[in-house]
Amino acid sequence: KLTIESTPFNVAEGKEVLLLVHNLPQHLFGYSWYKGERVDGNRQIIGYVIGTQQATPGPAYSGREIIYPNASLLIQNIIQNDTGFYTLHVIKSDLVNEEATGQFRVYPELPKPSISSNNSKPVEDKDAVAFTCEPETQDATYLWWVNNQSLPVSPRLQLSNGNRTLTLFNVTRNDTASYKCETQNPVSARRSDSVILNVLYGPDAPTISPLNTSYRSGENLNLSCHAASNPPAQYSWFVNGTFQQSTQELFIPNITVNNSGSYTCQAHNSDTGLNRTTVTTITVYAEPPKPFITSNNSNPVEDEDAVALTCEPEIQNTTYLWWVNNQSLPVSPRLQLSNDNRTLTLLSVTRNDVGPYECGIQNELSVDHSDPVILNVLYGPDDPTISPSYTYYRPGVNLSLSCHAASNPPAQYSWLIDGNIQQHTQELFISNITEKNSGLYTCQANNSASGHSRTTVKTITVSAELPKPSISSNNSKPVEDKDAVAFTCEPEAQNTTYLWWVNGQSLPVSPRLQLSNGNRTLTLFNVTRNDARAYVCGIQNSVSANRSDPVTLDVLYGPDTPIISPPDSSYLSGANLNLSCHSASNPSPQYSWRINGIPQQHTQVLFIAKITPNNNGTYACFVSNLATGRNNSIVKSITVSASGTSPGLSAGA
C-alpha cells in the first residue's frame, strides 16, 4: 500500500522536511503533490511526468519544494504555514489513480522567555505575587524553577494559565529566592534569566545586646540594637521615654547612677510602615553592689530535685566566685557552674547539701561576699529506730519506748500496738506492765512535706521466765586465716546476764576471742580450723536461766600441701602403679593428676597397670578448694627399672 513518511515529523522552523514515499507502484505515468488531505487543482504544489522527466509547478508551489524521481518531496526553509497534510496523487500507465496522505508539524525555535511580576516589593504575610512567563507561545509547555530546583509542593504555590503563571500567596521572607521559567516545545527549550523575589518584612522584635543590665559607675555603656528587617530597619533610642538619637548603637561614656533607667530601642521599616520596640532596664551601681543569692527552689526534695543558685546582680566583665561550707567548691559531678560562673547548679540534692553557700563578686581591690544561704533540703523519714533495743521485759516494770527517724521537716510519730493506734507522740510509756502487754509495737514516722511514711515494728515479750536463747552469726562459712565471725545471743533482754561455752567448757583465754555488747556478742578473729567447735550461749536473771542449742562453726580451710602414698619412688617393670593423693581441706578438694606435665584424670587415686620404663617421670597431684578459692600441689618422681636389674626394688601394689 502506498504510504507517506514525514522525516522528521516535528520540524523546526527554517529547517527542511522530506515527505518520503513508500511502496510506489510500478508502470507509472506520473504523480502530483497537493497541500491538504485531498486532490485539489487549486492546491497543487508540483506535478511530475515520468516519460519526459519534467516537473511542473502548481498554484501552491512556493519555490522551496523539490520533487525526486522516486516521488518523494523535499520542502526547505520550513515556515509555520507549512504545518499540515500533504497528498500524493499517483497516475499509473493504465490511468488508474492511487492516493496517499502524510503530515508534519512545524514548531518555532522558541524565544528566550522573561518573567514579569505583578508586585516587585511584596510585604510578608500580606501580599501575593504572580509571576508570568513571557511571551505566550502556542504549543509551548511552561515550567518553573526555584533556586534551580523544581517547584516544592506548597499550598501557598499555585500554577495557572497553562502553568504560565506562578502565584505565591501570603509571601514570607523564606520566599526570597531565584525564580526562573522554562518553555519547551518538541524542537527547543528555553530558560529565562533569574528573578530574585524581594520580600519586605519586619522589623521583628529588636534584640538589645549585651544582655547584662547591671553596670558599675565609671564604666562605658555601649548598647547595640538589631531587628530582622527588609529593607534594614531604622533605629531610635529612648531613655526613660525621652528620645536620644537615631542610631543602631547607643554609647554613653563614664556612666553614673543617674544613667539608671529604662532604655528603649525602636526599629522602624519605612517600606512596611511597621515599628517594634524592646525595653531593657539598666542599673548603675555607685559601688560594686553587695551580691545576693537567689534560688529557683527554696524547699528541694532529696534525691529528686535540682537547685540552681544564682549570684545577683548580673554585672558586665565581672568574676563570680562560690564557697560551700566556707570552702571553695569541691569537685563533684553533682555540682555544675554556668559558663560565666554566675549560676551554681546542684543536681539531685541530698541532705548533706544544706550549705551554707556564699557567692562573691571580684573587683580590682577586693571580693564582695553575699550573705550565706542555707538550703532547706526536705528528706526522710528514714526507717525509724525504736530504743531501747530490749525485746524481753519482766512483769511489773515500766515500758518506755522512744522512736526517732531522720527527717526534714521533723517527722510526726504514731504508735500502734498489734495494729491498733495508740497515740501520736514520739515516746510511748506504759507503767507496771503485765504479760498482756506482750505484742507487736509499731512506730510510724510521717513527713508532711514529702508525704512519705516509714514504719518499724518491734516484738515485745513480757514474761517472768526467760526464753530459750538462740545464736545468730554474721558469717556461716568463714575462711581460715582470713575471716572473723561474730556470734550474737538472741534476744536482747533487760537486766539479763549473758554467758558462753565452747565444747561444753567456759571460754578459753585467747587474744582472738572478744566479748562485747554486755557479753551478748562473741567475736572470733582470724578463725582457724581448730575453731570448728560447738558454741552455746546462756542467759540468766534473778528468777530463771536458759541455754541455746549448740551452733557448730563450719570453718573453710585448705587445701593443705597434699601427700602422695605410698612413698616409694622406684618400681620394677611389670608392676602396677597405684598412687593415692590426700590433702586436708574443708570442703573436700577436687583432685587431678599430671604425668610429665600432661593432664591425666580427675580422681584421688591414679592407677596404671603393668608399668614399663616408659612410665618414668614426674607425677604431680593438684588439689583445689572451690569454697576457699585456694589451690595446692605436690610432685613425685617415679623411676621404673627393667625386671631383675637392681635389688631392693618394690614390686608395686
Epitope: L110, S150, V187, S188, A189
Partner: nanobody
Framework: EVQLVESGGGVVQPGGSLRLSCAAS????????LGWFRQAPGQEREFVAA????????YYADSVKGRFTISRDNAKNTLYLQMNSLRPEDTALYYC????????????????WGQGTLVTVSS
Amino acid sequence: EVQLVESGGGVVQPGGSLRLSCAASGHTFSEYALGWFRQAPGQEREFVAAINWGGGWTYYADSVKGRFTISRDNAKNTLYLQMNSLRPEDTALYYCAASSDYAGGNPTGYPYWGQGTLVTVSS
C-alpha cells in the same frame, strides 16, 4: 564560565556501541542545557541530540532517533551519549555544547563548546 571535556570516543565495528561522556567544570552544571553535535571530515557541523536543564526534555536528529540516547547526571556534572547500532555514516568528531538559556538543534544557541572526541565506525 563552564569548561567541557569530551571522552569515550574510539574505533568500533558497525552495529557496535559506544558511550560518550562530557565532564563539566567551572560553574553550576544544572544551570546549563546541553547538546551533542558532530562534524564529519569536509562536512558542516550537524546536530545530534539535546537535553534541557533538569533532564526531562530531550530532542534528537532524525538520523539518530531510536539508536542514540542523551542523558545527564547533575550530581556528577556529566553529560552522556549512549550510541547503539552504530553505522559507518556516524563516523565524526563529536562535540559537547552548553547554554544557560537554550536547548535545541541550532548550534548558534550554544556559547560553550568542548574540543571533541573522535568516533570511527569501520569494519
